[in-house]
């Protein structure tokens, strides 16, 4: 008996070939001997089966002795043994129809779980193997689960169902809803304008939700809300904004915030959350602000940084085009009685300058 695998919703063509290369009488029946379709001369006739409106054949092939049964919009319950009667012969074809669906929405938040469920006909014992867009293979039976979805899991999942040494392939498009970056850090000199951008890692036709930026200033004992906003059809509208700092928010995606100036009291870290309509959970992006200030008070030249710096960052003070006078893995450095000239305060990571502030020291007479 020939075995054919089909996919739910697809179209399948079951073949039946006569030895004579001409149009002769044929019938297709199911295992209950109920006629599905056949011919009467050059006319297609249909029986009382459940497939009535979904069954067809190719009249153009009859003259060549081919009498296929075409079943459109396959259903799991179409799984059956189909019998083609032609020239006093019976050709049997076993059709097994499978369906593979994501048990929830195909748009999932980062960190959520994806469950793929296989619908299969009774009596079948298929195995399933799925390959994620990043090349990870998972195997299972009726259900496959992937926990803690990551951004790289966005894309087309290719799943192969194996039954009776036959294969059928499913492709499922999964969109992982996340920000492009989980965390970002902005380095600014005191007084400079600060821009925070929160690009999303996905695109959808219409995006609706609401969000908030909470800020934990290094100098503050507790965090506070800086801004709340709505997102409707991709348009951003501010609901509430703190008066200090005077934040501005863009009305278009990607989400974008502007702080008029970097000040030590704003240095710290923020957490932007975005709750999307009809989704449980929230998207998060952390943003950090490091602020540098170089000052000269009487005979003391000081350079300070505020905000979340890593312990391996180096803070230096140097006279232009000279070796560093002082270099420390600390958040403040100073030079007593500095020489006249242009001094540079540098915040660097393994030799790469992240932030630089210049201050002119005038000669003392």
């Amino acid at each position: 008996k020939k075995v054919v695998l089909g996919k739910k919703g697809d179209t399948v063509e079951l073949t039946c070939t006569a030895s004579q290369k001409k149009s002769i009488q044929f019938h297709w029946k199911n295992s209950n001997q109920i006629k599905i379709l056949g011919n009467q001369g050059s006319f297609l006739t249909k029986g009382p089966s459940k497939l009535n409106d979904r069954a067809d054949s190719r009249r153009s092939l009859w003259d060549q002795g081919n009498f296929p049964l075409i079943i459109k919009n396959l259903k799991i319950e179409d799984s059956d043994t189909y019998i083609c009667e032609v020239e006093d012969q019976k050709e049997e074809v076993q059709l097994l129809v499978f369906g593979l669906t994501a048990n929830s929405d195909t748009h999932l938040l980062q960190g959520q779980s994806l469950t793929l469920t296989l619908e299969s006909p009774p009596g079948s014992s298929p195995s399933v193997q799925c390959r994620s867009p990043r090349g990870k293979n998972i195997q299972g039976g009726k259900t496959l689960s992937v926990s803690q979805l990551e951004l790289q899991d966005s894309g087309t999942w290719t799943c192969t169902v194996l039954q009776n040494q036959k294969k059928v392939e499913f492709k499922i498009d999964i969109v992982v809803l996340a920000f492009q970056k989980a965390s970002s850090i902005v380095y600014k000199k005191e007084g400079e304008q600060v821009e925070f951008s929160f690009p999303l890692a996905f695109t959808v036709e219409k995006l609706t939700g609401s969000g908030e930026l909470w800020w934990q200033a290094e100098r503050a004992s507790s965090s506070k809300s800086w801004i709340t906003f709505d997102l409707k059809n991709k348009e951003v509208s501010v609901k509430w904004v703190t008066q200090d700092p005077k934040l501005q928010m863009g009305k278009k995606l990607p989400l974008h915030l502007t702080l008029p100036q970097a000040l030590p009291q704003y240095a710290g870290s923020g957490n932007l959350t975005l709750a999307l309509e009809a989704k449980t959970g929230k998207l998060h992006q952390e943003v950090n602000l490091v602020v540098m200030r170089a000052t000269q008070l009487q005979k003391n030249l000081t350079c300070e940084v505020w905000g979340p710096t890593s312990p391996k960052l180096m803070l230096s003070l140097k006279l232009e085009n000279k070796e560093a006078k002082v270099s420390k893995r600390e958040k403040a450095v100073w030079v007593l009685n500095p020489e006249a000239g242009m001094w540079q305060c540098l915040l660097s990571d393994s030799g790469q300058v992240l932030l630089e502030s210049n201050i002119k020291v005038l000669p003392t007479w």
Epitope: Q193, S237, M249, G250, K251, H256, T258
Partner: antibody
Framework: EVQLLESGGGLVQPGGSLRLSCAAS????????MSWVRQAPGKGLEWVST????????YYADSVKGRFTISRDNSKNTLYLQMNSLRAEDTAVYYC???????????WGKGTTVTVSS | AIQMTQSPSSLSASVGDRVTITCRAS??????LGWYQQKPGKAPKFLIY???TLQSGVPSRFSGSGYGTDFTLTISSLQPEDFATYYC?????????FGQGTKVEIK
């Protein structure tokens, strides 16, 4: 062809009211944000108000906040601007504009003139 | 509100000249900037959006550039029909604000 036709302008005394209308055609009105922009005689352009698509969020310039109300009737493909407590400085040509998908004002009507004078 | 400062307020040029108009925002507005052309007694015409994207039907002699706070509109070779007033518009957030305009006159 996308078209915007303003009407309702005219001469009004200070403190009076006027309602401007803008009839839209040639596009799916309900899916686009719409705005009013004005231009005082011999001056530059000044944004007045915007109403988002079918959500209906409204935004106003500080100079008109509390006095002007923007609204839309999607069933009639019409945008409105209700102007109350009119002042001499509201004298201008008022343009109706359509926003594109990127929220820029891409199509403008020919304008209707509002004169506030005693 | 974000202030938009346009310069120059007026300029005289000849047909064929390269003309540059600048617009400065009082704070960063990404590339959320549009340019409009207005002729006397007419409604403004939309030229450029997202700082550098030409609106369909606008001649390629017009170009825009810039990001953050500084933006430029350039007409590579001025044509007789280009004599008009040009406005920039910040579309970063509300209230939307226009520059005060630059009048391009015939020398």
């Amino acid at each position: 062809e996308v078209q915007l036709l303003e009407s309702g302008g005219g001469l009004v005394q200070p403190g009076g009211s006027l309602r401007l209308s803008c009839a839209a055609s040639g596009f799916t009105f309900s899916t686009y944000a719409m705005s009013w922009v004005r231009q005082a005689p011999g001056k530059g352009l000044e944004w007045v108000s915007t109403i988002s698509d079918n959500i209906g969020n409204t935004y106003y310039a500080d100079s008109v906040k509390g006095r002007f109300t923007i609204s839309r009737d999607n069933s009639k493909n019409t945008l409105y601007l209700q102007m109350n407590s009119l002042r001499a400085e509201d004298t201008a040509v008022y343009y109706c504009t359509k926003d594109n998908e990127d929220y820029y004002m891409d199509v403008w009507g020919k304008g209707t003139t509002v004169t506030v004078s005693s | 509100a974000i202030q938009m400062t346009q310069s120059p307020s007026s300029l005289s040029a000849s047909v064929g000249d390269r003309v540059t108009i600048t617009c400065r925002a009082s704070q960063g507005i990404r590339n959320d900037l549009g340019w409009y052309q207005q002729k006397p007694g007419k409604a403004p015409k939309f030229l450029i959006y997202a700082a550098s994207t030409l609106q369909s039907g606008v001649p390629s002699r017009f170009s825009g550039s810039g990001y953050g706070t500084d933006f430029t509109l350039t007409i590579s070779s001025l044509q007789p029909e280009d004599f008009a007033t040009y406005y920039c518009l910040q579309d970063y957030n509300y209230p939307r604000t226009f520059g005060q305009g630059t009048k391009v006159e015939i020398k």
